[in-house]
Interface confidence: low
């Protein structure tokens, strides 16, 4: 059994999240994950889900009674979602920490928007796509 | 030329983001995107980037002078990133709108944690991965 399971059970007690009434009014994440089979679609959704959990855990980082559980789960997320790749995890955290109300961040984001958009489509970087685009550029 | 380019230039004026000093102290998104070539890694990062822009645009949704630009760019993001798939966009927006301070949301998130974790690894759902994992479990 993965180490996170026991710790997640501990968090369930702490958050009083074991009762059947918790499932009322549908799920947060599981229903959405069921909708998407394609790996890249799943990553789009899981990226938001993982950042949600990181934010949630951050809110409770000073609570000693669940600190070990939170750390274990975060470490396991690191292994499973980021393949234990520290650079990947760091880049992800950087992105989640940008503040949308910071004026410098706003300016930089708008400054980079055109290039970000150009890279959004899956095939944006392949030679074949580039060539076909050129035909329509005139 | 994609319609978003002209509108992004308009936003650059509004946010005073055309000046060369904006690039001081590195980039927000472009440097990170350069680090990841693998499609699923890119989606993890782009998911955070797109949600950042949606949040930023939401803050300025009442400003008539940039409304058309914002709408055009959002629509183009919808085409490029969500493949014009309304369901995908809706699921994504649902995830970005969950509040980490809402007690019911917290309980549900913890309730679903074990199942979410079980699905995080790319090949978590394939039989082949499951079998190869078993060999190393002892």
């Amino acid at each position: 059994q993965d180490p996170y399971v026991k710790e997640a059970e501990n968090l369930k007690k702490y958050f009083n999240a074991g009762h059947s009434d918790v499932a009322d009014n549908g799920t947060l994440f599981l229903g959405i994950l069921k909708n998407w089979k394609e790996e890249s679609d799943r990553k789009i959704m899981q990226s938001q889900i993982v950042s949600f959990y990181f934010k949630l855990f951050k809110n409770f980082k000073d609570d000693q009674s669940i600190q070990k559980s939170v750390e274990t789960i975060k470490e396991d997320m690191n292994v499973k979602f980021f393949n234990s790749n520290k650079k990947k995890r760091d880049d992800f955290e950087k992105l989640t920490n940008y503040s949308v109300t910071d004026l410098n961040v706003q300016r930089k984001a708008i400054h980079e928007l055109i290039q970000v958009m150009a890279e959004l489509s899956p095939a944006a970087k392949t030679g074949k796509r580039k060539r076909s685009q050129m035909l329509f550029r005139g | 030329q994609d319609p978003y380019v002209k509108e992004a230039e308009n936003l650059k004026k509004y946010f005073n983001a055309g000046h060369s000093d904006v690039a001081d102290n590195g980039t927000l998104f472009l440097g990170i995107l350069k680090n990841w070539k693998e499609e699923s890694d890119r989606k993890i990062m782009q998911s955070q980037i797109v949600s950042f822009y949606f949040k930023l645009f939401k803050n300025f949704k009442d400003d008539q002078s940039i409304q058309k630009s914002v709408e055009t760019i959002k629509e183009d993001m919808n085409v490029k990133f969500f493949n014009s798939n309304k369901k995908k966009r809706d699921d994504f927006e649902k995830l970005t709108n969950y509040s980490v301070t809402d007690l019911n949301v917290q309980r549900k998130a913890i309730h679903e944690l074990i199942q979410v974790m079980a699905e995080l690894s790319p090949a978590a759902k394939t039989g082949k991965r499951k079998r190869s994992q078993m060999l190393f479990r002892g």
Partner: nanobody, 116 residues
Framework: QVQLQESGGGLVQPGGSLRLSCAAS????????MSWVRQAPGKGLEWVSS????????TYADSVKGRFTITLDNAKNTLYLQMNSLKPEDTAVYYC?????????RGQGTQVTVSS
């Protein structure tokens, strides 16, 4: 050259109110947005609220929505920020900023301290 001068800051208890003013001069364009931004100790500049002179459109950061109100008196060329239900985390130097076409001008700022 646009000149901006803020006033109205001070020390206030949590839950209290303050009204900031910003006197503006030197505008040669009617296409401008006026904003309030703030800088807490050791933090970067944070956008608080904007009003567009041409359209009257108003926007607020989520952290102040429902508590702060921005208004612009065109006749007096003065921007206001009514701040109610103040919290300790609202402590900062508040600046009035103008986006005139694509140039940003900022005043000297006024200190707001929320503490009991």
């Amino acid at each position: 050259q646009v000149q901006l001068q803020e006033s109205g800051g001070g020390l206030v208890q949590p839950g209290g109110s303050l009204r900031l003013s910003c006197a503006a001069s030197g505008f040669t364009s009617s296409n401008y947005a006026m904003s309030w931004v703030r800088q807490a100790p050791g933090k970067g500049l944070e956008w608080v609220s904007s009003i567009n002179s041409r359209t009257g459109s108003i926007t607020y950061a989520d952290s102040v929505k429902g508590r702060f109100t921005i208004t612009l008196d065109n006749a007096k060329n003065t921007l206001y920020l009514q701040m109610n239900s103040l919290k300790p985390e609202d402590t900062a130097v508040y600046y009035c900023a103008s986006r005139v076409d694509d140039r940003v001008s900022r005043g000297q700022g006024t200190q707001v301290t929320v503490s009991s």
